[in-house]
């Protein structure tokens, strides 16, 4: 079938989903295509315990993640409702800086050095996580 | 010996449709996304299409957006290009081949022979 | 969509020769830039991927530098089998676009 039970090769597991991290940047809509064409999405941060292990593998280096406001409302690639959902800006962000002198605001959201995160246009070659979920059917116990 | 063989090719009148497969062997083709890549005679390599290995994300280029379906059947190991709406300028040699991601660094390493695609009245 | 260009389009070489490809983007691709072989009526063969990665299997004649905008490849000697065309393709964006080729021929 096509149930991924197992994380491919070079791919972390983590909580029943995999992560693959770039040491590569690229503009985030190319690294959410490239998630895609992996059969995956750029990170969703749903908890602290997350973002903790995320924040681990990265370490202080600006890195992509599935979040941006592109078409207005801040939305999560995979369809996580962002308002009720975690959150871990840096104070005073997002801010849609206009300052940058690259054209237009800040749209994608990324970790900072610190873990927090920040705004920033989506043009920047940044660092990226990849993430997919194990199958929900491979997760139940095995009948005995 | 990992292997790409394309077919379905062959002569087709202006607006009509063809499908060509691509049948993988001795990979797990499921692990892979696949892309297909023509070449007009005398003329370079073009991009055309792209999907995931599971199927679930597809890319095109805009010569043949909304006219050509990139697929895949992975119980039988294969990839399939519909093409629908055919113009001249799709005349082409078609070859298959598949993506590898090393480190985040996409290429295309195994590559079928083609199959030749004839758009013409 | 980014452009690719190559220089020259066609050159002639004697066997034995040093001979640069260049290949040029529209914008900078960092460092996701492929370079393929082809020989004619044959599919292309990954020469290059990563700007510089030798692929396996490849002749360390084989060699290829830069990054952002400007990319090189070059055969250190040239040899009989190394009379084909070669592509350049960027992999920093869909579409993939390729560079339009540059033909290798004997002098």
């Known amino acids: 079938g096509s149930e991924r039970t197992c994380c491919p090769v070079n791919w972390v597991e983590h909580e029943r989903s995999c992560y693959w991290f770039s040491r590569s940047g690229k503009a985030w809509a190319d690294a959410d295509n490239y998630c895609r064409l992996e059969d995956a999405h750029l990170v969703v941060v749903t908890s602290w315990e997350e973002q903790k292990f995320v924040q681990h593998h990265i370490g202080p280096v600006n890195t992509w993640m599935g979040l941006h406001d592109q078409n207005g409302p801040w939305k999560w690639v995979d369809g996580t409702d962002y308002e009720t959902g975690f959150k871990n800006w840096r104070p005073e962000q997002p801010d849609d800086w206009y300052g940058h002198g690259l054209g237009g605001g800040e749209d994608c959201a990324h970790f900072t050095d610190d873990g927090r995160w920040n705004d920033d246009v989506c043009q920047r070659p940044y660092r990226w996580v990849c993430e997919t979920e194990l199958d929900k059917a491979s997760q139940e116990p095995p009948l005995l | 010996e990992v292997q790409l063989l394309e077919s379905g090719g062959g002569l087709v009148q202006p607006g009509g449709s063809l499908r060509l497969s691509c049948a993988a062997s001795r990979f797990t083709f499921s692990s892979y996304a696949m892309s297909w890549v023509r070449q007009a005679p005398g003329k370079g390599l073009e991009w055309v299409s792209v999907i995931s290995g599971r199927g679930g994300s597809t890319f095109y280029a805009d010569s043949v957006k909304g006219r050509f379906t990139i697929s895949r059947d992975n119980s039988k190991n294969t990839l399939y290009l519909q093409m629908n709406s055919l113009r001249a300028e799709d005349t082409a040699v078609y070859y298959c081949?598949?993506?590898?991601?090393?480190?985040?660094?996409?290429?295309?390493?195994?590559w079928g022979q083609g199959t030749m695609v004839t758009v013409s009245s | 969509d980014i452009q690719m260009t190559q220089s020259p389009s066609s050159l002639s070489a004697s066997v034995g020769d040093r001979v640069n490809i260049t290949c040029r983007a529209s914008q900078s691709i960092i460092s996701y830039l492929i370079w393929y072989q082809q020989k004619p009526g044959k599919a292309p063969r990954l020469l290059i991927y990563a700007a510089s990665s030798l692929q396996s299997g490849v002749p360390s004649r084989f060699s290829a530098s830069g990054s952002g905008t400007d990319f090189t490849l070059t055969i250190s000697s040239l040899q009989p089998e190394d009379f084909a065309s070669y592509y350049c393709q960027q992999t920093n964006s869909i579409p993939f676009t390729f560079g339009p080729g540059t033909k290798v021929d004997i002098k």
């Open positions: 081949a598949r993506r590898i991601a090393v480190a985040g660094n996409e290429a295309f390493d195994i």
